[in-house]
């Protein structure tokens, strides 16, 4: 899977929540960021994430559609210079400071269940998705026989009118 352009085709500012309407939040602790999945109080402000969309070609052996075989890849950045990364060895999702060009671990294939319900598949480990485990984000293997609608890998994107804090 190769990214076809250096620049994102679009960027989208959203808050991220689970299928069960828990919010994904980010907290700076001891000079590193922690990611939490939690219920927010009624008027508590949701954290915002900058989703950058990139086009990517299917590997040629995977798709018979030539130039048509495109996917959407996303990177997720909750704050300046930090991006969500897949740690495939630890099956964890972590926030790391990175410089562009971003490593492959920062890219996720976007799957839509509907326009505001999405899943994020690790670019570096196909079949493994960002999911919720014990109130944290983790990498979860989804068998091809399973329906991707399994709730713990589904996330909702809700629009926000605030500016990203980049």
């Amino acid at each position: 899977m190769s990214i076809t352009g250096i620049s994102p085709i679009t960027e989208y500012l959203a808050s991220l929540s689970t299928y069960n309407d828990q919010s994904i939040t980010f907290a700076l602790e001891d000079e590193s960021y922690e990611i939490y999945v939690e219920d927010l109080k009624k008027d508590e402000k949701k954290d915002k994430v900058l989703l950058s969309y990139y086009e990517s070609q299917h590997p040629s052996n995977e798709s018979g559609d030539g130039v048509d075989g495109k996917m959407l890849m996303v990177t997720l950045s909750p704050t300046k210079d930090f991006w969500l990364h897949a740690n495939n060895k630890e099956h964890s999702v972590e926030l790391h400071k990175s410089e562009k060009p971003l490593p492959d671990q920062a890219f996720f294939v976007l799957h839509n269940m509907h326009s505001n319900s999405v899943s994020f598949e690790s670019k570096t480990d196909p079949g493994v998705f960002i999911g919720v485990k014990d109130n944290h984000l983790a990498l979860i293997k989804v068998d091809s026989s399973e329906n991707l609608s399994t709730e713990n890998i589904l996330f909702k994107l809700s629009e926000t009118h605030h500016h990203h804090h980049h």
């Epitope: 798709s63 559609d65 839509n112 326009s115």
Partner: antibody, heavy 121, light 106 residues
Amino acid sequence: EVQLVETGGGLVQPGRSLKLSCVASGFTFSNYWMYWIRQAPGMGLEWVSSINNDGGNTYYLDSVKGRFTISRNNAENTVYLQMNSLRSEDTATYYCAKGHYSYSSYSIDYWGQGTLVTVSS
Amino acid sequence: DIQMTQSPSVLSASVGDRVTLSCKASHNINKHLDWYQQKVGEAPKLLIYFTNNLQTGIPSRFSGSGSGTDYTLTISSLQPEDVATYFCFQYNSGWTFGQGTKVEIK
């Protein structure tokens, strides 16, 4: 080359049924969302129904809910639209269309030539 | 449901003119918008996706812009072969088409 070929249109009486088929080629069918979009004579485009790549999620225009059913057979590269209890206002050219990106409902890139459905007594 | 409103309904311009078509959404659609061209008797053809990305094979005189609720398709120098109806299409929340703008040559 991407090709989408719709069949099954024709003249049908109100209250009757019709099943449209769309055979796809030139791309990995099972990776893509598929759509039915219609256009009444001389009018604009109207989204009718969508189905995700594995067929597990389907969506409908309110006015066709409960009457139309979208389905797909990934082994045969075909998407269907079963239309029951047809009304005169369903008269339109029905287009089959393909999602722009694998696994994604964002954007539509290729369309078939359409099949005309006329509902009239 | 999101409504899409295109203006004008009909646009008449001369060959070589710069032409601007408008599409307004009833809610913020976050740049999740395509533009299609439909010539008489033909299926629609994708011109622009995600607001401002030119589809492969489409002439560079076509461009798109916008954000939030307001979007624009521009033809920098109108050609006779551009006579068609142009539709915007949002996919941010469900799927909705605008009613179309018919472009004619004066």
